[in-house]
């Protein structure tokens, strides 16, 4: 049903869904802090622009007794229950921030007449692609897929002179929410990744993964997995690995690789880590002090969601335009705004663009080093280390199929 929005006469409200089921197990208090910090910045920016308006956030909590799994499995109903709560209270803001689970976002988008924008810190799955009023502030699976296809096909780098067309994907079902949807996208037979590869097999058992590491009859030298170094170690341990195996470890929301005192363990030498370029001012900010490196991005996405709303509100108010219109709801895309940690770019479909970074372990220094960067906005790879000190032969990435000549 249509719910009136608290969104006019100089008073603008943001509805923040505080769901028990979340993409990351982050205390709701930390997310509240992030939102409040964002509000302070927005108020300052609006004041500086000569706009004398009130901006507030309403935190909508769900009934933790019913939806208490803590992860995203039971989030579908929780999201709809919260919407029902908003509807009953007749208290909808100009914008909805949250949910972060793909299931709940998909269902909420499907089951509501969305004449208001929805901003999500998460919703990684392909089912949330191309939604007209949904904005996603953490890299969705589609962006990862485009990087992987681009990297697989690349053969014009000093350290990668072969195009690849094959891969194993390790997916055992215990993944975190982001990894679950990333791997789900790679597994899907109709996805861009599957379409562009000649051979792809999903490994679901630990033993399958372990056997491939030394199997002379393997169909690919490349294995994609998602998680942190500890996750890989639990699986691989100190097992021997064939010299032309390349493990791609997707660990986007983890800043720890860039910390000064970090040394790469020996089991990471055959691994390329795909992560996001770290923020520079986050480490000391008040809202992120209590956060682990993996959680910073999640809280930051909430904060940036507030700043995005402030950015759009300022534009519409300066142009004398109405906020409670479909035009406003559809405007949260194809733009760059000033985020907490620098400019944030959203693509034509409202998905955040970012710089992905591929790291390798230097055999000389045992440190993680940047091999290349990838700009998701222009789908382009930029080599950083032209002469990496790889573990692989001739300091070049091997072919994806043993014994195959140049591609």
């Amino acid at each position: 049903s249509q719910v009136s929005q608290n969104c006019h006469n100089g008073s603008y409200e943001i509805s923040v869904l505080m769901m028990g089921n979340s993409a990351f197990a982050e205390p709701l208090k930390n997310l509240e802090d992030a939102v409040n910090e964002g509000l302070e910045i927005v108020r300052g920016r609006l004041q500086n622009a000569g706009l004398n308006v009130t901006v507030n956030a309403t935190f909508m909590y769900s009934d933790g007794l019913i939806h208490n799994s803590g992860d995203c499995r039971s989030s579908t109903c929780e999201g709809l229950d919260l919407l029902r709560k908003i509807s009953n209270a007749q208290r909808m803001g100009c914008v909805l921030i949250g949910p972060s689970c793909t299931y709940s976002t998909f269902q909420m988008y499907l089951d509501t007449e969305l004449s208001y924008p929805m901003i999500s810190a998460g919703s990684f799955g392909l089912s949330c692609d191309y939604k007209e009023t949904l904005t996603r502030l953490m890299s969705p699976a589609r962006k990862l897929m485009y990087f992987l296809v681009n990297f697989w096909k690349t053969n014009d780098l000093p350290f990668k002179t072969y195009s690849w067309s094959t891969s194993y994907v390790y997916k055992n079902g215990t993944e975190t929410e982001d990894c679950f949807w990333y791997l789900n996208a790679l597994e899907a037979s109709v996805s861009y990744f599957s379409h562009e590869l000649g051979f792809k097999v999903v490994l679901r058992q630990d033993k399958e993964f372990q056997d491939i590491l030394m199997d002379h009859n393997r169909k690919s030298n490349v294995i994609i997995m998602c998680g942190g170094p500890e996750f890989l170690y639990k699986l691989k341990g100190d097992r021997a690995v064939a010299e032309d195996i390349v493990i791609i470890l997707v660990d986007l929301f983890n800043d720890q690789y860039f910390e000064d005192n970090v040394t790469a363990p020996d089991y990471m030498k055959n691994v390329l880590v795909l992560t996001l370029s770290p923020g520079n001012s986050l480490l000391n900010s008040s809202f992120s002090r209590n956060l682990s490196p993996t959680k910073r991005d999640f809280a930051l996405a909430y904060l940036n969601g507030i700043l995005l709303f402030g950015h759009m509100l300022k534009i519409f108010l300066e142009n004398g335009e109405n906020i409670t219109t479909p035009k406003f709801a559809h405007a949260f895309r194809n733009l760059t705004f000033e985020g907490y940690d620098g400019p944030v770019t959203l693509d034509d479909w409202g998905d955040v663009d970012s710089t992905m970074v591929l790291l390798y372990t230097s055999v000389d220094t045992k440190k993680y080093k940047v091999l290349l960067t990838y700009d998701t906005h222009v789908n382009k790879t930029y080599p950083v280390d032209m002469s990496p000190t790889f573990t692989w032969k001739n300091s070049k990435l091997p072919n994806d199929i043993t014994g195959r000549g140049p591609q």
């Epitope: 014009d156 940047v370 790879t381 140049p406």
Partner: antibody, heavy 118, light 113 residues
Framework: QVQLVQSGAEVKKPGASVKVSCKAS????????MHWVRQAPGQGLEWMGI????????SYAQEFQGRVTMTRDTSTSTVYMELSSLRSEDTAVYYC???????????WGQGTLVTVSS | DIVMTQSPLSLPVTLGQPASISCRSS????????????LSWYHQRPGQSPRRLIY???NRDSGVPDRFSGSGSDTDFTLKISRVETEDVGIYYC?????????FGQGTKVEIK
């Protein structure tokens, strides 16, 4: 406008080293890779290597591995190419060339003639 | 490495007449990762440094007269000059940037008959 200005001509004895500079202006120095290309008298163009001015990492053509060193000084927006153990066959004009889009040479320096003679 | 072969190596032309230079690569220059073909043409006048005329097969650099055009795909490429002028003399090089390392053709010398 984009300009690449190279150091002057050099005459060297066999076995010596030469260091050629290339000063860039008119663009953000660290945002573009730089290549070195040489041309022996009456011969074609030969790619020598590339440097990433942002981090200083390099990659060299097989033929020059061990003899060439490319460096940069971001404070002066200058890249350098040093070639050691010179022999008469290294007599050539050495060019720096900016990479406008990975492996696309859009601007060239005026060239530096290096003569190796005893 | 990709071998680039130009022909002819020498091309005597009459002023005002068309000229055509061919460039063949030992492998396809279609870059799989982005669908582009990175084939450029350079012109070097006597005593000068090379100047890029064409990039990505057929795109003219700014300031390059429209009498120059590039065409081709896969492994076969052509540079055409519709009407040769005096300033067009010199050596023309094709260069590929689709594979590592970048490689040049051996050059085609254009002179007025």
């Amino acid at each position: 406008q984009v300009q690449l200005v190279q150091s002057g001509a050099e005459v060297k004895k066999p076995g010596a080293s030469v260091k050629v500079s290339c000063k860039a202006s008119g663009y953000t120095f660290t945002s573009y890779y730089m290549h070195w290309v040489r041309q022996a008298p009456g011969q074609g163009l030969e790619w020598m290597g590339i440097i990433n001015p942002s981090g200083g990492s390099t990659s060299y053509a097989q033929e020059f591995q061990g003899r060439v060193t490319m460096t940069r000084d971001t404070s002066t927006s200058t890249v350098y190419m040093e070639l050691s153990s010179l022999r008469s066959e290294d007599t050539a004009v050495y060019y720096c060339a900016r990479d406008g889009q990975w492996l696309q040479f859009d601007y060239w320096g005026q060239g530096t003639l290096v003569t190796v003679s005893s | 490495d990709i071998v680039m072969t130009q022909s002819p190596l020498s091309l005597p032309v009459t002023l005002g007449q068309p000229a055509s230079i061919s460039c063949r690569s030992s492998q396809s220059l279609l870059k799989k990762s982005d669908g582009n073909t990175y084939l450029s043409w350079y012109h070097q006048r006597p005593g000068q440094s090379p100047r890029r005329l064409i990039y990505k097969v057929s795109n003219r650099d700014s300031g390059v007269p429209d009498r120059f055009s590039g065409s081709g795909s896969d492994t076969d490429f052509t540079l055409k000059i519709s009407r040769v002028e005096t300033e067009d003399v010199g050596i023309y090089y094709c260069m590929q940037g689709s594979h590592w390392p970048p490689t040049f053709g051996q050059g085609t010398k254009v002179e007025i008959k």
